[in-house]
């Protein structure tokens, strides 16, 4: 019996289409497969950022795969052909691995890249990113921000920079259509007549960096002799009510502080007849049903009631 062998795929490579980290891994069928013309071969693909302990593994019949990578580091990938047992009248046959790597040739020393990059998606409407210039760079250094997400034909440059002392230190983004729940890629590169500037790459999903507006229209309603219902409204904007968590701070008579986290726009507070003053503030955050992370809003304006009779039906400031 001759041992059945299969070659690895041809032309295995990583292609950078200029999407700032979203890369294509592609290959061609192996040579000498004509004995298995009727057989659908599969490919086992493994890939990772260099330095990562774990490989991502994909088994596919396709000749390409796409995924996002951190371009601050190199990428390594390997692939082999799998001949299923149906094709060989026995056990699965694997080829040797074909391997490839990809990295952006770094320019400049690491200290020249932007520092303290911070991006916030205000009220799920306005993206703003800010940074500090690299360490020891001269004033002639300028940074440029490029971004891409699936749906854009090509990477776009920021058109509305925030400046300080003539240097770009941030970017106000335009309206980003259909940009959430997908990876958002950013590259900040730089130029200087004095020395090369290291590029930085960032990837996040916009729904995870949302900072909502604070809640509005805070009110009190007496529910019973010992209960007061605190109510508020969701902030104006595109975020639906089901996406909010709230944190409340309640102060009774300048002493007792109650903190609570709730999922809807009400909170019932137990009170005593001795309560003379009640104040509360609320802030909002996108919850786990709509994002994996988020940023607390600023606190709302304080709503207080002061007086002798906390038994009135509705207490509005």
């Amino acid at each position: 019996d001759t041992e059945i062998k299969v070659n690895p795929p041809q032309d295995f490579e990583i292609v950078d289409p200029g999407y700032l980290g979203y890369l294509y891994l592609q290959w061609q069928p192996p040579l000498s497969l004509d004995h298995f013309k009727e057989c659908t071969v599969e490919y086992e693909l493994k890939y990772r950022n260099i330095g990562s302990e774990t490989w991502k593994t994909i088994i596919t019949k396709n000749l390409h795969y796409k995924d996002g990578f951190d371009l601050n580091k190199g990428i390594e990938a390997k692939i082999h052909t799998l001949l299923p047992w149906q094709c060989t009248n026995g056990s699965e046959v694997q080829s040797s691995w074909a391997e490839t790597t990809y990295w952006i040739s770094p320019q400049g020393i690491p200290e020249t890249k932007v520092q303290d990059m911070d991006c916030v998606y205000y009220n799920w409407q306005y993206l703003l990113c800010s940074w500090k210039p690299g360490i020891g760079v001269l004033l002639d250094t300028n940074y440029n921000l490029f971004y891409w997400y699936e749906g854009l034909d090509h990477a776009l440059q920021c058109v509305d920079y925030i400046k300080a002392d003539g240097q770009n230190i941030g970017c106000r983004f335009p309206y980003l259509e259909a940009s959430d729940y997908k990876d958002f890629y950013i590259c900040v590169n730089g130029s200087s007549e004095n020395k090369p500037i290291r590029s930085s790459y960032f990837t996040f999903q916009l729904q995870n960096i949302v900072k909502p507006l604070p809640p509005v229209y805070l009110t009190f309603t007496r529910e019973s002799s010992c209960e007061i219902k605190l109510k508020w409204s969701i902030p104006l904007g595109p975020i639906p009510a089901r996406c909010f968590d709230y944190e409340i701070e309640i102060r009774e008579d300048d002493t007792t502080l109650v903190t609570a986290t709730v999922e809807n726009e009400t909170y019932t507070l137990k009170t005593t007849n001795e309560t003379r003053q009640l104040c509360f503030v609320v802030r909002s955050k996108v919850n786990i049903y709509c994002s994996d992370d988020g940023i607390w809003s600023e606190w709302s304006d304080k709503q207080c009631w002061e007086g002798e009779d906390l038994s009135k039906k509705t207490l509005l400031r």
């Epitope: 070659n7 032309d11 950078d16 294509y24 592609q26 069928p29 040579l31 004509d34």
Partner: antibody
Framework: EVQLLESGGGLVQPGGSLRLSCAAS????????MSWVRQAPGKGLEWVSY????????YYADSVKGRFTISRDNSKNTLYLQMNSLRAEDTAVYYC???????????????WGQGTLVTVSS | DIQMTQSPSSLSASVGDRVTITCRAS??????LNWYQQKPGKAPKLLIY???SLQSGVPSRFSGSGSGTDFTLTISSLQPEDFATYYC?????????FGQGTKLEIK
């Protein structure tokens, strides 16, 4: 519709250089390997060079190795052939062609440009 | 390098004839063989790939066969537009090579 349009040919002296370009349209350029094939006047076809879709793999005919360099700019959908140390025997029509593969690894040239004439003469 | 030899070098035939062109490889190339048609002043056109697969848009009167070292291109009923030069090309090696061509002329 797949289109390949070569340019850059012309008359050059022996020992001189020339850079051919091939502008591609109508397909996802980075997904395909590309080849240059030449045809001397009144002669048959001679394969010159191949480059994979991402540019990681390049191959050359022995007759041009060390003198010619194939490259591509996927952002511009353009294939190049840099020809140095040109000789009289490099005189030919140069075609760029798109490479495809059958599902079992058979490579073939399924679309060709109309060619550009390179004449090496003193 | 793998050498490809076509025969005949030239061939005269009439419209409606059945024509066969052969191509021999200097070593086994399995079924990694392609056929191209070229008309004067024009670019080559792919007819058959992988020895027997008909390229999309090519008339079914063209067919290819063979494996290993011996291959044939057959035109079942010659049409006026088929008078051209035909080339075989091996694709097993990373250095592809063409046959010298077969010129098909009107008798």
């Amino acid at each position: 519709e797949v289109q390949l349009l070569e340019s850059g040919g012309g008359l050059v002296q022996p020992g001189g250089s020339l850079r051919l370009s091939c502008a591609a349209s109508g397909f996802t350029f980075y997904s395909y390997g590309m080849s240059w094939v030449r045809q001397a006047p009144g002669k048959g076809l001679e394969w010159v060079s191949y480059i994979s879709g991402g540019g990681s793999y390049t191959y050359y005919a022995d007759s041009v190795k060390g003198r010619f360099t194939i490259s591509r700019d996927n952002s511009k959908n353009t294939l190049y052939l840099q020809m140095n140390s040109l000789r009289a025997e490099d005189t030919a029509v140069y075609y760029c062609a798109r490479g495809s593969y059958s599902h079992y690894g058979a490579h073939y040239l399924d679309y060709w440009g109309q060619g550009t004439l390179v004449t090496v003469s003193s | 390098d793998i050498q490809m030899t076509q025969s005949p070098s030239s061939l005269s035939a009439s419209v409606g004839d059945r024509v066969t062109i052969t191509c021999r490889a200097s070593q086994s190339i399995s079924s990694y063989l392609n056929w191209y048609q070229q008309k004067p002043g024009k670019a080559p056109k792919l007819l058959i790939y992988a020895a027997s697969s008909l390229q999309s848009g090519v008339p079914s009167r063209f067919s290819g066969s063979g494996s290993g070292t011996d291959f044939t291109l057959t035109i079942s009923s010659l049409q006026p537009e088929d008078f051209a030069t035909y080339y075989c090309q091996q694709a097993l090696s990373s250095l592809p090579t063409f046959g010298q061509g077969t010129k098909l002329e009107i008798k």
